[in-house]
């Protein structure tokens, strides 16, 4: 359910998708991993307003509670919904293989 | 993957699942919900320090850029693995009916 | 060094179009947020308009909707502002901006501030 | 009219602390962070705090922000000549759909 796709705090700062350039070395893959050199990280970042593209139920009961005890529950928190596959050749024994990971890139955000 | 179940902040303090006691004026539910008055939420709270409880390769990723460049990628996020049904009694136009909700209860937590 | 440089200012009659440029440098371009903020001789800041690092979300100020449109291209690390049907009440130095990327500790959100300004382009419209 | 409510003025003397102060409502100043600007003469703005009370690397400790309820203020201690400027405070109004300044205030060294 996306519940409210509009952001209170201002444009951009509420949960979406975001494009952070890594090399394999800031992502420590340098000793297996050949190619890409660099990888186009796609993550969930941003705040979770009230039912702002709420994931599901439990998001919804952690907004309310959160309202009422901020100290005790935190907001939900932006998270991937869905990923894109993506192709890494990775060094090996005998040489190099392709391998698809389907959890690396974030495709879709919501807040749970 | 459950990488890494050894909270280094202290017992307690990482990412796991916690009982909140919830009425339905609480949660904003007493207009369409007979029953529970009262619901055990049971949530995600805690830190998410590296490696601890990753989801996938994608918190991985997010720990180690965090790591790098705290100020532009948050840490990963403790949240729900997995959920508990719950069933409610709801009020409808003619009476009552029961309503399984599976997506309310977190039953185990992970960070991502 | 992290810099942003308008240009496209001048001269224009009312009712008549231009197109400001911002030249970004010294920093991924496109990564962040970026704004246009206005200045009126002797006057306060006006907030213009804004655009999401990847085009896909843009706002308006109520005074410029319709006239104005914010654009990027980000494979030549440049903001645009095209600004039509325009009016003596638009003349102004108009500067560029772009929106700081810092996320707060725990709520993981982007601070809602311009943290790199430009010189400014001036504006004006009269016949 | 601006949307935020600032002092048009204010004055002190060197080494003396002076304090501006933003007025706004539940829709912006009320429900969102503020961000404070200094615009030296005949320069472009600079941000100073954002986020109600952070400064960015580079900017002194004499200046720091606050903000209680709809109101927020910029404090400013140990007065220099060089803080002579015009002081914006911004905040996003979501009733609005816009990012609202303050009318400025110029501040006087004597």
């Known amino acids: 359910a996306r519940n409210g796709d509009h952001c209170p705090l201002g444009p951009g700062r509420c949960c979406r998708l975001h494009t952070v350039r890594a090399s394999l070395e800031d992502l420590g893959w340098a000793d297996w991993v050949l190619s890409p050199r660099e990888v186009q990280v796609t993550m969930c970042i941003g705040a979770c307003p009230s039912q702002f593209r709420a994931a599901n139920m439990h998001a919804q009961i952690k907004t309310s509670l959160h309202r009422l005890k901020p100290d005790t529950v935190p907001a939900p928190c932006c998270v991937p919904a869905s990923y894109n596959p993506m192709v890494l050749i990775q060094k090996t024994d005998t040489g190099v293989s392709l391998q698809t990971y389907d959890d690396l890139l974030a495709k879709d955000c919501h807040c749970i | 993957a459950r990488n890494g179940d050894h909270c280094p902040l202290g017992p307690g303090r990482c990412c796991r699942l916690h009982t909140v006691r919830a009425s339905l004026e609480d949660l904003g539910w007493a207009d369409w919900v007979l029953s529970p008055r009262e619901v055990q939420v049971t949530m995600c709270i805690g830190a998410c320090p590296s490696q601890f409880r990753a989801a996938n390769m994608h918190a991985q990723i997010k720990t180690s850029l965090h790591r790098l460049k705290p100020d532009t990628v948050p840490a990963p996020c403790c949240v729900p693995a997995s959920y508990n049904p719950m069933v409610l009694i709801q009020k409808t136009d003619t009476g009552v009916s029961l309503q399984t909700y599976d997506d309310l209860l977190a039953k185990d937590c992970h960070c991502i | 060094e992290v810099q942003l440089l308008e240009s496209g200012g001048g001269l224009v009659q009312p009712g008549g179009s231009l197109r400001l440029s911002c030249a970004a440098s010294g920093f991924t371009f496109s990564s962040y947020d970026m704004s246009w903020v206005r200045q009126a001789p002797g006057k306060g800041l006006e907030w213009v308009s804004w655009?999401?690092?990847?085009?896909?979300?843009?706002y308006y100020a109520d005074s410029v909707k319709g006239r104005f449109t914010i654009s990027r291209d980000n494979s030549k690390n440049t903001l645009y502002l095209q600004m039509n049907s325009l009016r003596a009440e638009d003349t102004a130095v108009y500067y560029c901006?772009?929106?700081?990327?810092?996320?707060?500790?725990?709520?993981?959100?982007?601070?809602?501030?311009?943290?790199?300004w430009g010189q400014g382009t001036l504006v004006t419209v009269s016949s | 009219q601006s949307v935020l409510t600032q002092p048009p003025s204010a004055s002190g003397t060197p080494g003396q602390r002076v304090t501006i102060s933003c007025s706004g409502s539940s829709s912006n100043i009320g429900s969102n962070d503020v961000t404070w600007y200094q615009q030296l003469p005949g320069t472009a703005p600079k941000l100073l705090i954002y986020d109600d009370s952070h400064r960015p690397s580079g900017v002194p400790d004499r200046f720091s922000g606050s903000k209680s309820g709809t109101s927020a203020s910029l404090a400013i201690s140990g007065l220099r000549s060089e803080d002579e400027a015009d002081y914006y405070c911004?905040?996003?109004?979501?009733?609005?759909?816009?990012?609202?300044f303050g009318g400025g205030t110029k501040l006087a060294i004597l």
């Open positions: 901006a772009r929106y700081g990327i810092k996320t707060r500790t725990n709520n993981a959100y982007y601070a809602n501030a311009m943290d790199v």
């Open positions: 655009i999401s690092y990847d085009s896909s979300s843009k």
């Open positions: 911004g905040s996003w109004d979501y009733s609005l759909n816009a990012y609202v």
